[in-house]
Interface confidence: low
């Protein structure tokens, strides 16, 4: 799975007048990483793990970058012509990735009032616009503004692509946190489903990186996809991830089933606990 940096900025206008503030969130490897605090006008790390990524470095650079990006987006919103009465939003999502083979990907997406109207591959500079007439009009508006000075635009987008990757590399190089491997804690529980059946759930938590295989096996053979239910691999807020897989089995056959986990080259199997343990609720689901 590639390392990624994702910027999500939103600016607002009211009755055609662009508001002074902006909302900004940055995700690193899918984890909430930074948020722009509008009262303090600062980029703020999201939790201890985010602070650990940069160690004792200040967040001034991030603050400067987000402030500049917010200013650029406000200027872009000011050039959108169809702003009617009330509140409108312009959202920019920018993502860059570094893959295991060191190849890179960068893209940028614009949304107006939550609707995607313009995307750009920042490496090839190829633009994509949805078919709707509203999207076409908005895209033309924004592209015209961005192309007012062709040289500036070219520099701007090359710089955006380069800056995003540069920041991502800086985080990867400076951070032990992002190069670490944290093995998952695996926990198997059972709950009564219906008469004669039980639901067995295998949970993996607090692991890093994100890639994991978690599956139920019967007599050592993996069950088919359609007999298992998977949870998403989600950030747990501490820079690590959590997920689960569940299946329904016949009571009395528990010893035939194991949960198989594979993560960062290590693997383990986990049996179903014996006894009637009734799990009423779990914060994982």
């Amino acid at each position: 799975e590639p390392h990624s940096l994702r910027y999500n900025l939103t600016v607002l206008s009211w009755d055609g007048s662009v508001q002074s503030g902006f909302l900004a969130e940055v995700h690193l490897d899918g984890q909430p990483f930074l948020r722009y605090d509008r009262q303090k006008c600062r980029a703020k790390p999201q939790g201890q793990w985010a602070e650990d990524v940069l160690g004792n470095k200040t967040w001034d650079r991030e603050t400067r970058d987000l402030t500049g990006n917010g200013k650029d987006l406000r200027m872009t919103l000011a050039h959108i012509k169809d702003q009617k009465e009330g509140l409108h939003s312009l959202q920019e999502i920018r993502v860059c990735e570094i893959h295991e083979d060191n190849s890179t990907r960068s893209s940028q997406h614009f949304y107006y009032d939550g609707e995607l109207f313009l995307s750009q591959n920042l490496e090839t500079e190829e633009w994509t616009v949805p078919q709707s007439s509203r999207a076409q009009t908005l895209a033309m508006n924004v592209r015209n503004f961005l192309k007012e000075d062709a040289m500036k635009t070219k520099t701007h987008y090359h710089a955006m692509h380069a800056d995003c990757l540069q920041e991502l590399r800086r985080y990867l190089e400076s951070s032990v946190v992002l190069r670490r491997t944290v093995p998952p804690m695996v926990n198997v529980t059972r709950s009564e489903a219906s008469e004669g059946n039980i639901t067995v759930t295998c949970r993996a938590s607090s692991f890093y990186p994100r890639n994991i295989t978690l599956t139920w096996r019967q007599d050592g053979v993996s069950l088919s996809h359609d007999t298992q239910q998977w949870g998403d691999v989600l950030p747990d807020g501490n820079g690590t991830y959590q997920t689960w897989v569940a299946t329904r089995i016949c009571q009395g056959e528990e010893q035939r089933f194991t949960c198989y986990m594979e993560h960062s080259g290590n693997h383990s199997t986990h049996p179903v606990p014996s006894g009637k343990v009734l799990v009423l609720q779990s914060h994982w689901q």
């Epitope: 007048s17 909302l23 948020r35 509008r38 009262q39 939003s89």
Partner: antibody, heavy 117, light 107 residues
Framework: QVQLVESGGDVVQPGRSLRLSCAAS????????IHWVRQAPGKGLEWVAV????????YYADSVKGRFIISRDNSKNTLYLQMNSLRAEDTAVYYC??????????WGQGTMVTVSS | AIQLTQSPSSLSASVGDRVTITCRAS??????LAWYQQKPGKVPKSLIY???SLESGVPSRFSGSGSGTDFTLTISSLQPEDFATYYC?????????FGQGTRLEIK
């Protein structure tokens, strides 16, 4: 210190009018959107109206649109709410509130409006 | 208008408990959400803005999370002064709307 102080609350008959005021101090009033929020006795918070920092644009809740008028005088650091055609359901404590831009960390102490025959 | 639905509507808990209140928006509101605390006869007090930023002077036992449509206010260890009514509010678009409130009572 930062302060908003409402005044003008009263007991009025249905169909009558009333004007509320909100005096601001301790911050740059002309830089902020200011809102009216109300709370009927024993009920939750209900947003009523907002006026932009420059006084040009205004926005209202559907329940008061066409009956209430929000205005401001930046030279006097004062916000107003002109309430016309009052109804029993307008009975509430009226707060003025502000913040960065529309999350309210500055609240007045509230003024009570009772509409009753 | 965007509707905000808070759950639960009321909640009984003890001092020291960890309490979670959720707020669901009828459509995506990014992180334009605030949380307020109100005690009987008092003015609402801002706790959290931008979904997770702690208002100045608010104890760190209060925290907010979420973005899009699902948001959470958490009090990590209830103190006697925390028993009150809590409201969420969206400021993503006008009309601004509040949740119906969650009343937190002593068990």
């Amino acid at each position: 210190q930062v302060q908003l102080v409402e005044s003008g609350g009263d007991v009025v008959q249905p169909g009558r009018s009333l004007r509320l005021s909100c005096a601001a101090s301790g911050f740059t009033f002309s830089n902020y959107n200011i809102h009216w929020v109300r709370q009927a006795p024993g009920k939750g918070l209900e947003w009523v109206a907002v006026i932009r920092y420059d006084g040009i644009n205004k926005y209202y809740a559907d329940s008061v649109k066409g009956r209430f008028i929000i205005s401001r005088d930046n030279s006097k650091n004062t916000l107003y709410l002109q309430m016309n055609s009052l109804r029993a359901e307008d009975t509430a404590v009226y707060y003025c509130a502000s913040g960065p831009p529309d999350a309210f960390n500055i609240w007045g102490q509230g003024t009570m409006v009772t509409v009753s025959s | 208008a965007i509707q905000l639905t808070q759950s639960p509507s009321s909640l009984s808990a003890s001092v020291g408990d960890r309490v979670t209140i959720t707020c669901r928006a009828s459509q995506g509101i990014s992180s334009a959400l605030a949380w307020y605390q109100q005690k009987p006869g008092k003015v609402p007090k801002s706790l959290i803005y931008d979904a997770s930023s702690l208002e100045s002077g608010v104890p760190s036992r209060f925290s907010g999370s979420g973005s899009g449509t699902d948001f959470t206010l958490t009090i990590s260890s209830l103190q006697p002064e925390d028993f009150a009514t809590y409201y969420c509010q969206q400021f993503n678009s006008y009309p601004i709307t509040f949740g119906q409130g969650t009343r937190l009572e002593i068990k």
